[in-house]
Structure formats: structure tokens, C-alpha cells
């Protein structure tokens, strides 16, 4: 016999919530795998660019995205399938996963705050290497997409450490409309914008983390309530 009343409402709420979560994970995983396995990117992984080493931070970032996407899909599936099947085992596993993820988020938050300068440096390196790829291999659409995302999200273009060729390519092709890399090279420096994000706008990252944490707690409560509801309904 299935759950009834308010518990049934929780069941479908949990299903919808985790289906969206599973879809989001799928999108992240799909994009990350495209970035990783696109032939242009794969070729560049083994390439020495003159006297400059091949990009590596770019791939670390991609592997993190793959992991995040996979975990999201897995947890989303547990919540989604566990709710619709009214499986105490799956919901229990889902709850355990959420507890672990919550602990990881808290740990990552503390570590991130302590190492924010290093993270900012890595993000800048990630941007530089994506930019390097977009310039060196003009068919590397994945790298171009990453650069475009940086430029549009942070409303910046290039950095004060650009090579001559990168400056020229950016000036003609990759700056957001309305920005002029030559006159605004230092005003709209992406390195500066990244630094600003990790110092002056750190509260934004904090708010995002709190929102994620609240959602997790909310899901944990819902899964426990549903689990108890299933147990009670199976008794009668």
C-alpha cells in the first residue's frame, strides 16, 4: 500500500526536485565530456606550444566538472527513483549521500575560504589556458565557449598578461560587444575581475553555498519524512 495525503505530496515534490537535479547533472556531465573529448582539445592535451607547456589546469577543471555532474546524476537518480518506488533502501542511501555531500560542502567551503587566493590563481590559469587554446587552435570550439562564458559572466576581456597574438585575436573576435580591448585592456581585465570575485564579491559565493546547503537540508528532511511515512504505511 502506497503513502497517502501529505506524504504523497512530499513523494512527488522529492521526485520533481531530484529529476531536475538529475537533469542538471546530466547537462553538466555532457558539457564536461564534450569539453574533454572534443578532438581539438584532445590534440592540444599532448601539444607543446612553442616554449609554453601544454594546458593542464584546463583539464583539472574539466575533470572536476565531470565528477560534479556524475555525482549530481547519481544522487538525483537515488532521490528520484527512491521517491517514486517508495524504496526505504534507496531513500536511506540518498539521505546518506546528502549527509556526505553536505559535509563535503562545509569542508570545501572552509578550505575554499582559507585558500581563496590559490583558487583565484587557478581560475585565472584556467582562463588563460582556455584562451591559449582558443587562439592556438582556431577550431577549438570548446575553449572558445569557455572564454565566451568568462567574458560574458564577468563582463571582461583579456588580461594584462596577454601575448601579442592573443591581444590581436581578442581584439577582432572574442571580446563582448561594446568592449574595446585596446582602450579597456586594463579596465576590463579578466584577471582583475576574477580577483574581485574572490575578494570583494566573496559574499556572492557564500550566498550560493548557503542556498545549496539549505536545499540539501530541505531534501534530507523530505527524504527522512518520506522514509518514515513509507515505514508507517507498510505497518498498517
Amino acid at each position: 500500500m502506497g503513502v497517502e495525503g501529505c506524504t504523497k505530496c512530499i513523494k512527488y515534490l522529492l521526485f520533481v526536485f531530484n529529476f531536475v537535479f538529475w537533469l542538471a547533472g546530466g547537462v553538466i556531465l555532457g558539457v564536461a565530456l564534450w569539453l574533454r573529448h572534443d578532438p581539438q582539445t584532445t590534440n592540444l592535451l599532448y601539444l607543446e606550444l612553442g616554449d609554453k607547456p601544454a594546458p593542464n589546469t584546463f583539464y583539472v577543471g574539466i575533470y572536476i566538472l565531470i565528477a560534479v555532474g556524475a555525482v549530481m546524476m547519481f544522487v538525483g537518480f537515488l532521490g528520484c527513483y527512491g521517491a517514486i518506488q517508495e524504496s526505504q533502501c534507496l531513500l536511506g542511501t540518498f539521505f546518506t549521500c546528502l549527509v556526505i555531500l553536505f559535509a563535503c560542502e562545509v569542508a570545501a567551503g572552509i578550505w575554499g575560504f582559507v585558500n581563496k587566493d590559490q583558487i583565484a590563481k587557478d581560475v585565472k590559469q584556467f582562463y588563460d589556458q582556455a584562451l591559449q587554446q582558443a587562439v592556438v587552435d582556431d577550431d577549438a570550439n570548446n575553449a572558445k565557449a569557455v572564454v565566451k562564458t568568462f567574458h560574458e559572466t564577468l563582463d571582461c576581456c583579456g588580461s594584462s598578461t596577454l601575448t601579442a597574438l592573443t591581444t590581436s585575436v581578442l581584439k577582432n573576435n572574442a571580446c563582448p560587444s561594446g568592449s574595446n580591448i585596446i582602450s579597456n585592456l586594463f579596465k576590463e581585465d579578466c584577471h582583475q575581475k576574477i580577483d574581485d570575485l574572490f575578494s570583494g564579491k566573496l559574499y556572492l559565493i557564500g550566498i550560493a553555498a548557503i542556498v545549496v546547503a539549505v536545499i540539501m537540508i530541505f531534501e534530507m528532511i523530505l527524504s527522512m519524512v518520506l522514509c518514515c511515512g513509507i515505514r508507517n504505511s507498510s505497518v498498517y
Epitope: 616554449d51 587562439v135 592556438v136 582556431d138 601579442a164 591581444t167 573576435n173
Partner: antibody
Framework: EVQLLESGGGLVQPGGSLRLSCAAS????????MSWVRQAPGKGPEWVSY????????DYADSVKGRFTISRDNSKNTLYLQMNSLRAEDTAVYYC????????????WGQGTLVTVSS | QSVLTQPSSASGTPGQRVTISCTGS?????????THWYQQLPGTAPKLLIY???NRPSGVPDRFSGSKSGTSASLAVSGLRSEDEAEYYC???????????FGGGTKLTVLG
């Protein structure tokens, strides 16, 4: 060994057109940015244009913008420069040069081809 | 008039050390763009001599060295030899002109 061999230069009247070619060998042509650099008699070199490996990106010096067009054929390992509306000040030796991204400069140059614009 | 200013000539006797300067501005050398040096022997194409301000490509003798400070760069040739007699050009990128720029060249003469 990297080799770049220009051809197509010669005497042309003002307002005329000319197409320069550059045959490349000794390196992976399709993976490299290529450039044209010219040198007027008794003067220093002057950058003219560049083209990216798959022809996505191109740029020109202000002095030739709208008149010159750079292109490439990766299947033939050849770089081209189509020069229209030629002026007396375009008289120079035109060099084809490989652009090194790693070094951010012109690391190999051809022997050059002379273009003379005169009536 | 070139964007990068070089002395038109320089000279020295064999074994001597000669320095060639290249003066730019805040839109090229001073903007952080690398300076490169080319050697052009009579009747030949320019050949890369120094890249990235101070690096030598393989095959270039260590008698040639480069440096950069502020808005200018310099090329030093120590232990001068007769085969060093050539035209030397500096090169950088200029943000105002949105292109690569060269110096007017310095004719190095080895005396005696």
C-alpha cells in the same frame, strides 16, 4: 628543415593587382599561424597580415586594410596574399613568415619576393 | 618614422662589446609585450636572433644577449666578429596600432 618559398612578385602599375604565393615545407603547415611581412628598400620590416591555422582569424595592418586579402590552402601547404589597388608605397620585398605562438614572434622567414609598383 | 627607435648605426672592433638600443613607448614595449631581435645579413631575409626579450633560439651563439627595461630594450653583442656585420631590427606589438611593429634598423659595422 623549415622552408618558405615566395613567388608571384613583379612589376605592376598603380591601381593594379597581384597575387603572391608562399609554398611551405618542413613543418606542420596546417597547425601554424602564418604572416606576410614586407620591407621597402632601405627601410625596416613592416607587418602586413596574419592568418590562423584554419583561416578563422585574420588581421591586417591599417595601411593595407580593405586592399589586401590573406588566405591559405592547407591541402597544398600554401599561403596567399591577394593585393588589389596597389600604390607606389606598396613597393617592397614581401616575406612570408611563420608565426610562433609559443615565442610570440616571426620565427622563420622566406627569401622574399619583390613587388614594384610603378607606372 | 618607426614606432620603435633604433640608432641607425653602431660599430666596434673585433672582440669588442657593442650594445644596440631599441626605444618604444607604453603602448608597445612598456605595455609588457616581448621584444624580439632579428639579424639581416646583406641580401637575405631577417633571421630570429633573440626572442622574448632575452632568449636565444638554438644555433644562435651566446655572444648575443638581450634585455628589457621599462619602455626600452637592448641587444648586446660581445666578442664582436666580422660575420656579425649586418642590419639588426627590434620588434614588438603595439596596442595603439593593433599590430606588430619593427625598429628602423641598426647597421652594425665591424671595423679593422
Amino acid at each position: 628543415e623549415v622552408q618558405l618559398l615566395e613567388s608571384g612578385g613583379g612589376l605592376v602599375q598603380p591601381g593594379g593587382s597581384l597575387r603572391l604565393s608562399c609554398a611551405a615545407s618542413g613543418f606542420t603547415f596546417s597547425s601554424n599561424y602564418m604572416s606576410w611581412v614586407r620591407q621597402a628598400p632601405g627601410k625596416g620590416p613592416e607587418w602586413v597580415s596574419y592568418i590562423s591555422s584554419s583561416s578563422t582569424y585574420t588581421d591586417y595592418a591599417d595601411s593595407v586594410k580593405g586592399r589586401f586579402t590573406i588566405s591559405r590552402d592547407n591541402s597544398k601547404n600554401t599561403l596567399y596574399l591577394q593585393m588589389n589597388s596597389l600604390r607606389a608605397e606598396d613597393t617592397a620585398v614581401y616575406y612570408c613568415a611563420r608565426y610562433s605562438y609559443g615565442r610570440d614572434n616571426f620565427d622563420y622567414w622566406g627569401q622574399g619576393t619583390l613587388v614594384t609598383v610603378s607606372s | 618614422q618607426s614606432v620603435l627607435t633604433q640608432p641607425s648605426s653602431a660599430s666596434g672592433t673585433p672582440g669588442q662589446r657593442v650594445t644596440i638600443s631599441c626605444t618604444g613607448s607604453t603602448s608597445n614595449i612598456g605595455a609588457g609585450y616581448d621584444t624580439h631581435w632579428y639579424q639581416q645579413l646583406p641580401g637575405t631575409a631577417p633571421k630570429l636572433l633573440i626572442y622574448g626579450n632575452s632568449n636565444r633560439p638554438s644555433g644562435v651563439p651566446d655572444r648575443f644577449s638581450g634585455s628589457k627595461s621599462g619602455t626600452s630594450a637592448s641587444l648586446a653583442v660581445s666578442g664582436l666578429r666580422s660575420e656579425d656585420e649586418a642590419e639588426y631590427y627590434c620588434q614588438s606589438y603595439d596596442t595603439n596600432l593593433s599590430g606588430w611593429v619593427f625598429g628602423g634598423g641598426t647597421k652594425l659595422t665591424v671595423l679593422g
